[in-house]
């Protein structure tokens, strides 16, 4: 059974992931971002179901495409270089979902824009955090 300290750690990691995703969304979804329209031509694959930490596998598999899109944006829109930002997210995702679990991600038929994609995972983080508090 999860201890209160492990629950607290999970909550902190989810809050960190949430802040990173919100920072990306705010950085790109900004009228000062001259590359926004180009970034919206990229499509992302969404999870069929995202209700548990193991479903973060679906986010992990989309991190490389996410980095490619962020490379289009001017670096001043973010505090970190896209590579470092995605690397940080990857570390958190691996810790949260557990690297020993082998979960096969199932994707929805409909693809999404980067805005929809980020909003989906932001909602996921908020939802899990709310169950922990």
């Amino acid at each position: 059974a999860p201890t209160s300290s492990s629950t607290k750690k999970t909550q902190l990691q989810l809050e960190h992931l949430l802040l990173d995703l919100q920072m990306i969304l705010n950085g790109i979804n900004n009228y000062k971002n001259p590359k926004l329209t180009r970034m919206l031509t990229f499509k992302f694959y969404m999870p069929k179901k995202a209700t548990e930490l193991k479903h973060l596998q679906c986010l992990e598999e989309e991190l490389k495409p996410l980095e490619e899109v962020l490379n289009l944006a001017q670096s001043k829109n973010f505090h970190l270089r896209p590579r470092d930002l995605i690397s940080n997210i990857n570390v958190i995702v691996l810790e949260l979902k557990g690297s020993e679990t082998t979960f096969m991600c199932e994707y929805a038929d409909e693809t999404a824009t980067i805005v929809e994609f980020l909003n989906r995972w932001i909602t996921f983080c908020q939802s899990i955090i709310s169950t922990l508090t």
Epitope: Y31, T37, E68, V115, E116
Partner: antibody, heavy 126, light 108 residues
Framework: QVQLVQSGAEVKKPGASVKVSCKAS????????ISWVRQAPGQGLEWMGW????????NYAQKLQGRVTMTTDTSTSTAYMELRSLRSDDTAVYYC???????????????????WGQGTLVTVSS | SYELTQPPSVSVSPGQTARITCSGD??????AYWYQQKSGQAPVMVIY???KRPPGIPERFSGSSSGTMATLTITGAQVEDEADYYC???????????FGGGTKLTVL
């Protein structure tokens, strides 16, 4: 309503330059980009490049790099496309088109070329 | 340079379903957009984001994408749908915009 009104037809000699204008109305000019697309007689559409009306950032098709310049004048909500060193195969109808991002709830979609100018015929002939 | 490939022509009888394809290596990760151009007129967007219909476009127009192929489908094609259709997308880096060569749809 949104309108893009282009300048009139031009006839130019090979080696000359042409500057086509595109005056926008009915929307906030600086919230969208302007793309330029051309169509040679009986041929398909060819994307030439794009300019952000917000900050003047440009992105040109590789084959036109060095010959094309796109600019905007935000005080008059007008976009310009200048093509230099004209050749006979530059004979085409030149269109300006608005492009930007649209939002439905929490989704963002790129909306390329939702409004077009009427087209400007540029004929290059000696 | 990046290319989108379309068939030069497609013919259907009125009321039949017309399918126009567009293939490009980057399409698994890039959205496709479709434009209709009638003779002597500026193009009109009929599909954006692979499958979304802009306001005012009839329901008979639909779009889909799978792998490297995007498809525009006109269910119950009408005589007024006779036009040139162009797919449009960007390359894998997102900076280079490309139109397909165009498909002439004949409804007779």
């Amino acid at each position: 309503q949104v309108q893009l009104v282009q300048s009139g037809a031009e006839v130019k000699k090979p080696g000359a330059s042409v500057k086509v204008s595109c005056k926008a109305s009915g929307y906030t000019f600086t919230s969208y980009g302007i793309s330029w697309v051309r169509q040679a007689p009986g041929q398909g559409l060819e994307w030439m490049g794009w300019i952000s009306a917000y900050n003047g950032n440009t992105n040109y098709a590789q084959k036109l790099q060095g010959r094309v310049t796109m600019t905007t004048d935000t005080s008059t909500s007008t976009a310009y496309m200048e093509l230099r060193s004209l050749r006979s195969d530059d004979t085409a109808v030149y269109y300006c088109a608005r492009e930007g991002a649209i939002y439905y709830d929490s989704s963002g979609y790129y909306f390329p070329f939702d409004y077009w100018g009427q087209g400007t015929l540029v004929t290059v002939s000696s | 340079s990046y290319e989108l490939t379309q068939p030069p022509s497609v013919s259907v009888s009125p009321g039949q379903t017309a399918r126009i394809t567009c293939s490009g290596d980057a399409l698994p990760r890039k959205f496709a957009y479709w434009y209709q151009q009638k003779s002597g007129q500026a193009p009109v967007m009929v599909i954006y984001g692979d499958s979304k219909r802009p306001p005012g476009i009839p329901e008979r127009f639909s779009g889909s994408s799978s792998g490297t192929m995007a498809t525009l489908t006109i269910t119950g094609a009408q005589v007024e749908d006779e036009a040139d259709y162009y797919c449009y997308s960007t390359d894998s880096g997102g900076d280079v915009s490309v139109f397909g060569g165009g498909t002439k749809l004949t409804v007779l």
